[in-house]
């Protein structure tokens, strides 16, 4: 029989962790069998930032510095896994680390609030409620987000007003609307390290309605009213 | 084969959300990234952002920071990119690229969805 | 991030000439880790998505015929295509696959003179 190299399980092993992990934190780990069925020893080669350590046995790869992101995400470095004992023949994969920003996705409306309206003309100051969301990991505490107006030529119409870390109230400030379409900017910071910010659109239509519904010409769809 | 077949084209206003769909097949959906790039008119490529199906892990560009969403769905294969916000220079031809074998370049290109922002 | 250059912005070769296309990154794309450098090129013809040529600046994608070649390390890059046929009038592309986040050159036109 002729001896074989180990095989890995995989030609890439793909590992994310967040960028102020702690050291020592076992951030990935790669596994190979031996076509014998000799045991192997892991090793890693062209980790030039001084960045890993890996588990000869067990493959397991930990952190042994602070990883910086600015460095340049993926960190690549190439894992051998040598038979032990035997023709000692060796094979390489590759470990590739993908560092992730501490708060990674920016702030969202968490629906689709196409198809709001009030009725023209406003016989009193107006609102609607709107939620948001994102989807980073929030493992302690929910969402806490802050609302403001998109741009400062809004804040002649209209006033956002937070409820509570996820839901934010957006009113007019007058009743002199036109018989339109106005696309509301808000702006959202999720307070995160480091804060991300999100601007998010509201269309709100001020039209005519007929029995509590925004009058429309045979075809189109009635919106959602709110008020 | 691998193929990745996006959703049509669109007409949107200004400030207004466009969802753009890509429906992938002949490959295991969660081994691979999944990038969205896009082309201007007469322009050049410009990528927006990817997401790893495996475990819903987005990276965007930093310019689309806020106004962009990837999301994906295990069940139908297919991953979504959403854009808000929309302005007129945000009219372009939308490409899904399904990252290559161990590595990120783009190795399968969608046919593109061409969205219109005008008033 | 990294910035990728293309030169030139157009050329125009003679059917079975040789076209190089040239591009330079910002950052070095060689990688002292895995011993790659992380850079692709792509071919856009009129009407259709881009089609990838090379990756890992000099491995061919499968299909991709041997008149395309790509060379290089660290900066600075070059596409090849050693003899032209009418069907190589498109605009190439290279990107970097180095670091996040992935970024392009402007592109080259090439053309038949």
């Known amino acids: 029989d002729v001896n074989e190299a180990p095989q890995f399980s995989q030609h890439v092993f793909q590992a994310k962790v967040s960028e102020d992990v702690a050291i020592g934190t076992k951030v990935g780990n790669v596994t190979a069998k031996d076509p014998e069925g000799l045991d192997i020893s892991y090793s890693l080669r062209g980790d030039t930032r001084g960045w890993l350590k890996i588990d000869h046995v067990t493959g397991e790869i930990f952190s042994v510095a602070p990883l910086d992101r600015e460095a340049g995400s993926p960190y690549r470095v190439q894992v051998v896994a040598t038979e032990v004992g035997g023709s000692s023949l060796s094979s390489v994969s590759e470990f590739h680390l993908i560092l992730m920003d501490v708060n990674d996705n920016p702030p969202r409306l968490a629906k689709d609030y196409t198809g709001l309206f009030f009725c023209h003309p406003l016989s009193a100051p107006g609102s609607l409620i709107f939620e948001a969301t994102d989807d980073d990991q929030h493992l302690f505490r929910g969402p806490h987000f802050t609302f403001s107006l998109g741009s400062g030529s809004l804040q002649n119409d209209w006033e956002v007003s937070k409820i509570n870390g996820t839901h934010a109230r957006l009113s007019t400030r007058h009743t002199e609307f036109e018989e339109r379409e106005y696309v509301v900017l808000i702006r959202i910071n999720d307070g995160g390290r480091p804060p991300l910010e999100g601007i998010v659109s509201l269309p709100v239509t001020f039209c005519s309605c007929v029995e509590g519904s925004c009058f429309r010409p045979a075809g189109h769809k009635h919106h959602h009213h709110h008020h | 084969q691998v193929q990745l077949v996006q959703s049509g084209a669109e007409v949107k206003k200004p400030g207004a959300s466009v969802k753009v769909s890509c429906k992938a097949s002949g490959y295991t959906f969660t081994d691979y990234w999944m990038n969205w790039v896009r082309q201007a008119p007469g322009q050049g490529l410009e990528w927006m952002g990817a997401i790893d199906p495996s475990d819903r892990y987005t990276n965007y560009a930093q310019k689309f920071q806020g106004r962009v969403t990837m999301t994906r769905d295990t069940s139908t294969s297919t991953v979504y990119m959403e854009l808000s916000s929309l302005r007129s220079e945000d009219t372009a031809v939308y490409y899904c690229a399904r990252g290559g074998y161990g590595d990120y370049w783009f190795a399968n290109w969608g046919q593109g969805t061409l969205v219109t922002v005008s008033s | 991030d990294i910035v990728m250059t293309q030169s030139p912005d157009s050329l125009a070769v003679s059917l079975g000439e040789r076209a190089t296309i040239n591009c330079k990154s910002s950052q070095n794309l060689l990688s002292s880790g895995t011993q790659k450098n992380y850079l692709a090129w792509y071919q856009q013809k009129p009407g259709q998505s881009p089609k990838p040529l090379i990756y890992?600046?000099?491995t061919r994608e499968s299909g991709v015929p041997d008149r395309f070649s790509g060379s290089g390390s660290g900066t600075d890059f070059t596409l090849t295509i050693s003899s032209l046929q009418a069907e190589d009038v498109a605009v190439y592309y290279c990107?970097?696959?180095?670091?996040?986040?992935?970024?392009f050159g402007g592109g080259t036109k090439v053309e038949i003179k």
């Open positions: 990107q970097q696959h180095h670091y996040f986040p992935w970024t």
């Open positions: 890992f600046a000099s």
